[in-house]
């Protein structure tokens, strides 16, 4: 799996989308998990409703929400009030029994808020030593811009 990069601004919301084949994954619940280390397990953060028919319901775990458009084949995860510690590797998963198929590998990057002039030294970016040659960047800054406000250019 290639890794898709989603960039969000600290303190704001980031929306991650994971497309999938709706027929192949028909009847399957979905989950969002955080990768613990390069070879470590993927720790479940939140999963869709226990009743697959109600997968459209937004389910929360803390500041993370998940909702699934089972007809359109799009899983959507919202990270509310994005913080530096939210940066890292995640997976969208399709569950079947005790197994889980990876729908998408996601790298979440947290960018400094351009309107916040505090020290941004604790913000996390993927280091040069980490190889994401196949990474595809999706700029997903979800804050609506105010009238006359200059959009902060995300770094890639």
């Amino acid at each position: 799996h290639n890794t898709t990069v989603f960039q969000g601004v600290a303190g704001q919301s980031l929306q991650v989308s994971c497309p999938y084949d709706s027929m192949k994954h028909w009847g399957r619940r979905k989950a969002w998990c955080r990768q613990l280390g390069e070879k470590g397990p993927c720790q479940r953060v939140v999963s869709t409703h226990n009743l697959w028919l109600l997968s459209f319901l937004r389910r929360w775990n803390g500041s993370t929400a998940i909702t699934d458009d089972t007809l359109g084949g799009t899983l959507t995860i919202t990270l509310r009030n994005l913080q530096p510690h939210d940066a890292g590797l995640y997976q969208c998963q399709s569950l079947h029994g005790s197994e889980a198929d990876t729908l998408r590998k996601v790298l979440v990057e947290v960018l400094a808020d351009p309107l916040d002039h505090r020290d941004a030294g604790d913000l996390w970016f993927p280091g040069e030593s980490e190889s994401f040659e196949d990474a595809h960047v999706e700029h997903s800054i979800s804050r609506s811009l105010l009238e006359g406000e200059i959009p902060f250019p995300p770094t890639s």
Partner: antibody, heavy 121, light 106 residues
């Protein structure tokens, strides 16, 4: 107006099966899920399962898995709930209820009047 | 499954009283809670959905509040037609109802 009309009362022997119907009118049948909820005499409400009238997909409460079957007939806008291997504890009023939902809410807004099922030898 | 505990199981009140019924979930259910009213021999009727939204046609004396694990249904001024049994229902997980609270005439 939106209405759910259920079939009449049934008396069954232990081990038998019962099939209760619920006919919908006043709205687009395939646009709303349907639920079945039962209530034993003097007891609370117990959710049994859900059916999507559009595709026929179902989900059942674990307690009823293997004993309950929910089906629908789109030509008559009717859903059915069949419960097999009946026992005395299944004596209850069985309700169908329409489900309405969005990303942050879900509720049962219209209910049938209920069908009394009595299981007795 | 998530367990819903309602309290009290019954209460006696007079017309005009302010009545409060509580519902506690065995784990957090966000705001995914509904309240229903049921009168003897009748089907349940939706009062409040998503913890605090009043269903169309329901009198404004009914209100709901809470999130997480603790929820409250309040009737600000009890009317004769409000004597009934009230149920909470969670929908964060497989649907479960509370045991009910019977509101009787004092």
């Amino acid at each position: 107006q939106v209405q759910l009309v259920q079939s009449g009362a049934e008396v069954k022997k232990p081990g038998a099966s019962v099939k209760v119907s619920c006919k919908a009118s006043g709205y687009t049948f395939t646009s709303y899920y349907m639920h079945w909820v039962r209530q034993a005499p003097g007891q609370g409400l117990e959710w049994m399962g859900i059916i999507n009238p559009s595709g026929g997909s179902t989900s059942y409460a674990q307690k009823f898995q293997g004993r309950v079957t929910m089906t629908r007939d789109t030509s008559t806008s009717t859903v059915y709930m069949e419960l097999s291997s009946l026992r005395s504890e299944d004596t209850a009023v069985y309700y169908c209820a329409r489900g309405v939902g969005g990303q942050d809410y879900y509720y049962m807004d219209v209910w049938g009047k209920g069908t009394t099922v009595t299981v007795s030898s | 499954d998530i367990q819903m505990t309602q309290s009290p199981s019954s209460l006696s009140a007079s017309v005009g009283d302010r009545v409060t019924i509580t519902c506690r979930a065995s784990q957090s259910i966000s705001s995914y809670l509904n309240w229903y009213q049921q009168k003897p021999g009748k089907a349940p009727k939706l009062l409040i959905y998503a913890a605090s939204s009043l269903q169309s046609g329901v009198p404004s004396r009914f209100s709901g509040s809470g999130s997480g694990t603790d929820f409250t249904l309040t009737i600000s001024s009890l009317q004769p037609e409000d004597f009934a049994t009230y149920y909470c229902q969670q929908f964060d997980d497989v649907f479960t109802f509370g045991g009910g609270t019977k509101v009787e005439i004092k």
